[in-house]
């Protein structure tokens, strides 16, 4: 039951989570004017991996994609590849982790089968989330670097009567969603491995012993009493098995509980 | 036809109120954000304050802000000027404008002419 | 706050001929984010509103007559009145929609002869 509800709730969050990270691919708010030297701005400036957008005052909102692939620079190409290598990660993950989940019957499936289609889904959201982390990352630090850059020149004028304010960017929106969501995928990934160790069949290093009785000195009843004909030494040689305790045989004759859907 | 027509304006003494109406006809309203601009009696063009659509975000000329305030209705297609502690400053002409591309006044009304004095 | 300075203040002209009239802004009306410049032109007529005639310093309004061209960028703009007409008599205001508050030159009052 544990086994199952962390399975599904890994795959509840990884959904989320790449949910998030599509999302946050998306939105246009990446990098967003700052607007501490100017907090009321009649022109304002924001920017995301595939297009700069210009919302004016008056309520239009101009947007322009950027239709240069060699024209841009090589961190924004490397934020989208981690970006879209997270989004491709985690969808094969979704998928996969969908026919891996306990609550599916899908054929004959065994449950090593699942236990290992889980393992490979939690694996696949671990590094979908960590793409996504490390993709806004990248992007925070190139923001911050040329915020500080901006900010060293933020005004160049001649003979200091004309001004030429240059925009700074600060974090979008798009960045914390992307945080999120990463660490959403993540954390989700890592139930899922969770969930692989527990619906993996239990190896043990014993082998299988079918104990028959023999003769009148041993008898088995049930409800963890010891029972006994005979007193003295030689019981120390009787084998008395308590009625709660199987041997291996035992336990593989009854269903398993992992048969149960 | 986009229409904008200005009413309420008048003579008022110095620390008086004074609350001018902008009524438009032939636009979706709602969707537009609005200024007042006025213009003084030396025929100099002051803008005053902007109304943005939709989250109805206010921006004032330092001058006005704590003692204009501008807001709108969209039911109404209505846009409204509450001026309070007027001063001799304020004697102008009172216009509306729509705002459009660029952040300019693409329509503007007749204005209403508002007096300041005692 | 953005200062915007007209000139000349005045200018007369007969008809027919070409008019250039100057606007000078304190700080840069470009915008980095589209490239574009928000600085408005308007033409008054004596006892009318302000009608809108150039935007984004040289986006002519639908129904404005061809002969009025806007340029300029940064911080120096120029509106051209390729053949004066005897109806463009006016005052033209230039005015700065980048930044709060939304600041306006003095103008210029074109007069014919």
């Known amino acids: 039951m544990a086994v199952t509800a962390c399975q599904g709730l890994g795959f509840v969050v990884s959904l989320i989570g790449i949910a998030g990270i599509i999302a946050a691919t998306c939105m246009d708010q990446w990098s967003t004017q700052d607007l501490y030297n100017n907090p009321v701005t009649a022109v304002f400036n924001y920017q995301g991996l595939w297009r700069s957008c210009v919302r004016e005052s008056s309520g239009f909102t101009e947007c322009r994609g950027y239709f240069t692939l060699l024209g841009l620079p090589a961190m924004l190409q490397a934020v989208r590849a981690l970006m879209i290598v997270g989004i491709v990660l985690g969808a094969i993950g979704l998928l996969v982790s969908i026919f891996a989940l306990k609550c599916i019957r899908i054929g004959s499936m065994e449950d090593s089968a699942k236990a290992n289609m889980t393992l490979t889904s939690g694996i696949m959201f671990i590094v979908s989330g960590l793409c996504a982390i490390a993709g806004v990352s990248v992007f925070a630090n190139m923001l911050v670097t040329n915020f500080w850059m901006s900010t060293a020149n933020m005004y160049t004028g001649m003979g200091g009567m004309v001004q030429t304010v240059q925009t700074r960017y600060t974090f979008g929106a798009a960045l914390f969603v992307g945080w999120v969501a990463g660490g959403l995928t993540l954390i989700g990934g890592v139930m899922m491995c969770i969930a692989c160790r527990g619906l993996a069949p239990e190896e043990t290093n014993y082998k299988a012993v079918s104990y028959h009785a023999s003769g009148h000195s041993v008898a088995y009843k049930p409800g963890g009493f010891k029972a006994s004909t005979g007193f003295g030494s030689n019981t120390k040689n009787k084998k008395i098995y308590d009625g709660g305790a199987r041997t291996e045989d035992e336990v593989q004759s009854y269903p398993s509980k992992h048969d149960y859907v | 036809e986009v229409k904008l027509v200005e009413s309420g304006g008048g003579l008022v003494r110095p620390g008086g109120s004074l609350k001018v109406s902008c009524a438009a006809s032939?636009?979706?309203?709602?969707?537009?954000?609005i200024s007042w601009v006025r213009q003084t009696p030396e025929k100099r063009l002051e803008w005053v304050a902007t109304i943005s659509s939709g989250d109805s975000y206010t921006y004032y000329l330092d001058s006005v802000k704590g003692r204009f305030t501008i807001s709108r209705d969209d039911a109404k297609n209505t846009l409204y000027l509450q001026m309070s502690s007027l001063r001799s400053e304020d004697t102008a002409m009172y216009y509306c404008?729509?705002?459009?591309?660029?952040?300019?006044?693409?329509?503007w009304g007749q204005g209403t002419s508002v007096t300041v004095s005692s | 706050n953005i200062m915007m300075t007209q000139s000349p203040s005045s200018l007369t002209v007969t008809a027919g001929e070409k008019v250039t009239m100057s606007c000078k802004s304190s700080?840069?009306?470009?915008?980095?984010?589209?490239?574009?410049?928000?600085l408005t032109w308007y033409q008054q007529k004596p006892g009318q509103p302000p009608k809108l005639l150039i935007y984004w310093a040289s986006t002519r309004e639908s129904g404005v007559p061809d002969r009025f061209t806007g340029s300029g960028s940064g911080t120096d703009f120029t509106l051209t009145i390729s053949s004066v007409q005897a109806e463009d008599l006016a005052v033209y205001y230039c005015?700065?929609?980048?930044?709060?508050?939304?600041?306006f030159g003095a103008g210029t009052k074109l007069e014919i002869k």
């Open positions: 005015q700065n929609d980048y930044s709060y508050p939304l600041t």
């Open positions: 700080q840069s009306l470009l915008n980095s984010g589209n490239q574009k410049n928000y």
């Open positions: 404008g729509r705002l459009g591309y660029g952040n300019a006044m693409d329509y």
């Open positions: 032939g636009i979706t309203f709602s969707r537009y954000a």
